[in-house]
Amino acid sequence: QEGNHEEPQGGLEELSGRWHSVALASNKSDLIKPWGHFRVFIHSMSAKDGNLHGDILIPQDGQCEKVSLTAFKTATSNKFDLEYWGHNDLYLAEVDPKSYLILYMINQYNDDTSLVAHLMVRDLSRQQDFLPAFESVCEDIGLHKDQIVVLSDDDRCQGSRD
């Protein structure tokens, strides 16, 4: 079994700062296709009172809108409740706060359950280093390699980053 970096040793505060989205995966491909509800891109994160606050970039009408979301802590380790396009059980599946973060969400919307995973990195130049870990985690939680979309610079709302 590989190392299980599922919780930042120094607490959630270590996740604060800038992040870059690298890859998405879902069992419902429409969710992560262009204009899909979960084809969104991380800009930055912060933590307060055990909750995670994220600024995400959402492509809209040829531009990218920055939206702030809060994922609230629960009584389960590394699990948060997030309201975004329905209810999401958001899990920190694997974390190395200085390098990469893999999120896993179980989305429930209109009696439909979907899975979405998200790989983000601190340094885009190292994104290839963490794709194998993302593929492994995806397989482990029930997503397949062919359900992964690796994002390009054009996808990521790079022009919207301050």
């Epitope: 079994q1 299980n4 492994s136 482990d140 939680i141 029930g142």
Partner: nanobody
Framework: AVQLVDSGGGLVQPGGSLRLSCAAS????????MGWFRQALGKEREFVAA????????NYADSVKGRFTISRDNAKNTVYLQMNSLKPEDTAIYYC?????????????????WGQGTQVTVSS
Amino acid sequence: AVQLVDSGGGLVQPGGSLRLSCAASGRTFSYYAMGWFRQALGKEREFVAASSRTGRVTNYADSVKGRFTISRDNAKNTVYLQMNSLKPEDTAIYYCAADDRFYGGDNPAFYNSWGQGTQVTVSS
């Protein structure tokens, strides 16, 4: 579906340890996410711990984190719950659960096979 048989429960003093086992038969065990839940008398079923297919991803209830460890041996078709520093409030029937669709974490609705349960009593 997979069949699950829980074992390892018993009476233990506060501060003691137990290891629960859940043996699976049926489909390939490595396809299954596994979870442990518990239910104390007169209370609702409560999440304890869960493991993804290889154990790469795990989650724990805050109330047991640092005391309980979930692990699995896919070669032996078995998932374990090592329980240390047991407290009277850990007294309950413990159930293992499995699902071959995806990792459902702490939500019992996302598990479609359940064991019969094993009683754990922590008392002096």
